[in-house]
Interface confidence: low
Amino acid sequence: GDMLIEKTIKREVVLEEGTTAFKNWVKTGTTVYRQFWIFDVQNPDDVAKNSSKIKVKQRGPYTYRVRYLAKENITQDPEDHTVSFVQPNGAIFEPSLSVGTEDDNFTVLNLAVAAAPHIYQNSFVQVVLNSLIKKSKSSMFQTRSLKELLWGYKDPFLSLVPYPISTTVGVFYPYNDTVDGVYKVFNGKDNISKVAIIESYKGKRNLSYWPSYCDMINGTDAASFPPFVEKSRTLRFFSSDICRSIYAVFGSEIDLKGIPVYRFVLPANAFASPLQNPDNHCFCTEKVISNNCTSYGVLDIGKCKEGKPVYISLPHFLHASPDVSEPIEGLHPNEDEHRTYLDVEPITGFTLQFAKRLQVNILVKPARKIEALKNLKRPYIVPILWLNETGTIGDEKAEMFKTQVTGKIK
């Protein structure tokens, strides 16, 4: 009966050797793709000279296979009922799912030039930086290949800096051969309602990026949730990509390959300003760019990126305030294409399908001492790229799932 099913589910979702959950958890059976769209700047000279609106044209998708590597350093701690691990990073280019090659070129913001005056605000230092920017023939914008932009290139300006700093720049550099973690998550053995919930990340229960409760590591990593998910539940999860915990709410019921799933979506409220959603007050960490915390739809993750002026948003500034998108032309936000969702099978709590969408932006501000930026009359949050990371349970796995889980319940 129902009790037996519940007992079986509770046993099989525990993260320990021999369970269904553990096998899929160690190495996901789902093929995960990460598609990139790059924002190619159409009027770089006009922007640098006249502080015009930035005209962008998205180009993509350029698709990589990701999350194909098994978790490593898996260590069970029977005392506190946790399991720790690291998630190795890797990306393999998929030419057949892409509009071009990794050698395709794009005109994008010069990441080092934009970041330098933000990191080094002292006027004297900026004079020195300016001479190095000029000497290296760098400017506000640059042309880079997809491979360089994503995974790293040796920056000519930074290479001239006369003291030891990293001279390699890339939106995701370093990525291949790195790991995310250490994650320590509850294995659910003593309390199934905590299964997969993150106990600590990199040895800490908080991030040290945000003030107050915004700094908490809440929920799971979104690959699964504690079982018996109800529509009224808010699903909380931590995303290292955006350096924060976030949440999803029930949106609709979906049939996924014959399996009834709940589609949970990230609500606009999660990206709201503190005026609209007071809970977000501690995600507003600076007053100028945020117009005294009234702007919304962008998240300053600079503290998590060694002080670099990195801002995360939804693609095309979906759910962002007009002041954020106004200086950029060529954006067309669309709820269906640009929102993030998780399709969760409610009995097991497994995420059987998902689409994680986010946009990486860099803040560039006027800098009087740096010629490449001195003509700017306003700050811009410049879109660099947006990504769509998706995974769907395979047909074979779906059949197996129906037989073992949903079929038995019917």
């Epitope: 600590s200 229960r205 908080n206 107050s212 409760y213 908490m216």
Partner: antibody
């Protein structure tokens, strides 16, 4: 079994300073965050101070901020609370508290008081002239 | 602040629920004190975790911003003041409830 023994309480004079020590045993002291919580006579509990396992993260309650210093010695399995410029309202029982984790949840004013899994018996402090 | 009822009472064998309301979704700890100034005992931490020395009749749960301590089959020696502890996002500080006195009739 986990044991937390506080010492250093007693009669103190206003404006003076006190030093409380908590000696821990029965667990790997260097793996857990430790803290102090106090209770004024006939009142509820109040967070005083906390320190992460490695001595890195520190959090003080608003009533003692600027007057309190928490330190720990992992070799000796002790955690010390020093409180200066004592006031009458510092009177109460001071409890040593162990977190179930290596760190407290930090807010800008203090940690979450949800993960205390063991307490000392308390040491009484009376601030009076 | 965290809000708790000042007192609850029950007869032996009954189930008692003590609630604690915070200002946002949170985790809760529950701490037992048999007399003022005496030792504190953790009966629940992290909303649902029970220390190994605590009998299974003590359990904890959370729903939204409210934490609940449930004592199933209450006994005379459960008579005590129960404090909840968490974080109060409205004041941005660590918080304890004022305590709930459990009387076993």
């Amino acid at each position: 079994a986990v044991t937390l023994d506080e010492s250093g309480g007693g009669l103190q004079t206003p404006g003076g300073a006190l030093s409380l020590v908590c000696k821990a045993s029965g667990f790997d002291f260097s793996s857990y965050a430790m803290g102090w919580v106090r209770q004024a006579p006939g009142k509820g509990l109040e967070w005083v101070a906390g320190k992460a396992k490695d001595g890195g993260g520190t959090a003080y309650g608003s009533a003692v901020k600027g007057r309190a210093t928490i330190s720990r010695d992992n070799g000796q399995s002790t955690v010390r609370l020093q409180l200066s410029n004592l006031r009458a309202e510092d009177t109460g029982v001071y409890y040593c508290a162990k977190s179930a984790y290596g760190d407290w949840f930090y807010g800008s004013s203090g940690p979450y008081a949800d993960s205390i899994d063991a307490w000392g018996h308390g040491t009484e402090v009376i601030v009076s002239s | 602040a965290l809000t708790q009822p000042s007192s609850v009472s029950a007869s032996p064998g009954e189930t008692v629920k003590i609630t604690c309301s915070g200002s946002s979704d949170s985790w809760y700890g529950w701490y037992q004190q048999k007399s003022p100034g005496s030792a504190l005992v953790t009966v629940i931490y992290d909303s649902t975790n029970r220390p190994s020395s605590i009998p299974s009749r003590f359990s904890g749960s959370t729903s939204g911003s409210t934490g609940t301590l449930t004592i199933t089959g209450v006994r005379a020696d459960d008579e005590a003041v129960y404090f909840c502890g968490s974080f109060d996002s409205s004041t941005d500080s660590t918080a304890f409830g004022a305590g709930t006195t459990l009387t076993v009739l």
